[in-house]
């Protein structure tokens, strides 16, 4: 499966939208910084087949979509930007789902790398628990927005590597 060019563009658009969503200076939130333990090793991409790698990406985007679809998120971010961001993520999920279906047919391997997906889930659980602890404060959301931007940037490198592998 050729991870479509549109998916790569979608990732870039999602990053731009995330950047535009910032409302307060990150410098005013330095005291709230937190290490969420991004599972970098799951995005090094050498150890598994393509369908598995795509399913890990899918999990990351799905959990991001879930995170920004909550009531607390709607109360924080500018509505039109949030809607565009959600639409972008939804499109990426569709792209990846189509890709996985194709790849599984080619590889005839199990669809998911369960342990890698669990690592992504635990990472997002840390983020949601952090937000809860901080009572969804503007600074907490700013820290999370910056973290998701960072994780998207890292996964973008992973996607580029996947594209080159084809």
């Amino acid at each position: 499966c050729d991870l479509p060019q549109t998916h790569s563009l979608g990732n870039r658009r999602a990053l731009i939208l995330l950047a535009q969503m910032g409302r307060i200076s990150p410098f005013s939130c330095l005291k709230d910084r937190h290490d969420f333990g991004f599972p970098q090793e799951e995005f090094d991409g050498n150890q598994f087949q393509k369908a598995q790698a795509i399913s890990v990406l899918h999990e990351m985007i799905q959990q991001t979509f879930n995170l920004f679809s909550t009531k607390d998120s709607s109360a924080t971010w500018e509505q039109s930007l949030l809607e565009k961001f959600s639409t972008e993520l939804n499109q990426q999920l569709n792209d990846l789902e189509a890709c996985v279906i194709q790849e599984v047919g080619v590889e005839e391997t199990p669809l998911m790398n369960v342990d890698s997906i669990l690592a992504v889930k635990k990472y997002f659980q840390r983020i949601t628990l952090y937000l809860t602890e901080k009572k969804y404060s503007p600074c907490a959301w700013e820290v999370v927005r910056a973290e998701i931007m960072r994780s998207f940037s890292l996964s973008k490198i992973f996607q580029e590597r996947l594209r080159r592998k084809e």
């Epitope: 959990q63 369960v114 669990l118 690592a119 889930k121 635990k122 840390r126 809860t132 602890e133």
Partner: antibody, heavy 122, light 107 residues
Framework: EVQLVQAGAEVKAPGESLRISCKVS????????ISWVRQIPGKGLEWMVK????????IYNPSFQGHVSISVDKSITTVYLQWSSLQASDTAIYYC???????????????WGQGTLVAVSS | DIQMTQSPSSLSASVGDSVTITCRAS??????FHWYRQKPGKAPELLIY???NLQTGVPSRFTGSGSGTECTLTITSLQPDDFATYYC?????????FGQGTKLDVR
Amino acid sequence: EVQLVQAGAEVKAPGESLRISCKVSGYTFTSYWISWVRQIPGKGLEWMVKIDPRDSYTIYNPSFQGHVSISVDKSITTVYLQWSSLQASDTAIYYCVRHYLTQSLVDYFDHWGQGTLVAVSS
Amino acid sequence: DIQMTQSPSSLSASVGDSVTITCRASQSVSNYFHWYRQKPGKAPELLIYSASNLQTGVPSRFTGSGSGTECTLTITSLQPDDFATYYCQQTHGYPFTFGQGTKLDVR
């Protein structure tokens, strides 16, 4: 088969140190959180602390923070709970438990160790 | 901390009966309610997770319902094995907390 096997009972004097263990097998150790739960004899259950064995990220119940510490040894898939100075009030059964994490990020305790009885008495 | 209050604290019943145990949280915990059974001298075991989902291997006579601040555990057609202590738990907020337990004994 998922198994959490805990060390045997311990009898200690107040002020002594102690480390109890929980040996895990039957699944990928780094994929699931592990917690410790305390049960004072004849009483209810209290969650103490949890750790992500992947990178030793920990979250403590404030009631236990500073009095106990949790650690892991990935090479032997074992989780530890440690006291530097035991008190009589630490007398209890301690269970290690595995967390399962759903797609919607709800976690619950799906496997329990058999428990370690710690008796602290002078 | 989120307080979990179970009622009743103790309950007497006979084999074949149906019983219901209620758990109330001091604030909403969505569906992050779970139920455990502890037999004397044994470790607790998971029965129901996320308020209403039956754990694999648990008989269908156990059912859970509710969300928000209240959930219930119903056991139909009680078996000898079911006379034990039952605990509810929330994992919505830290620290995770359990109810004080409901002891189910033979009438």
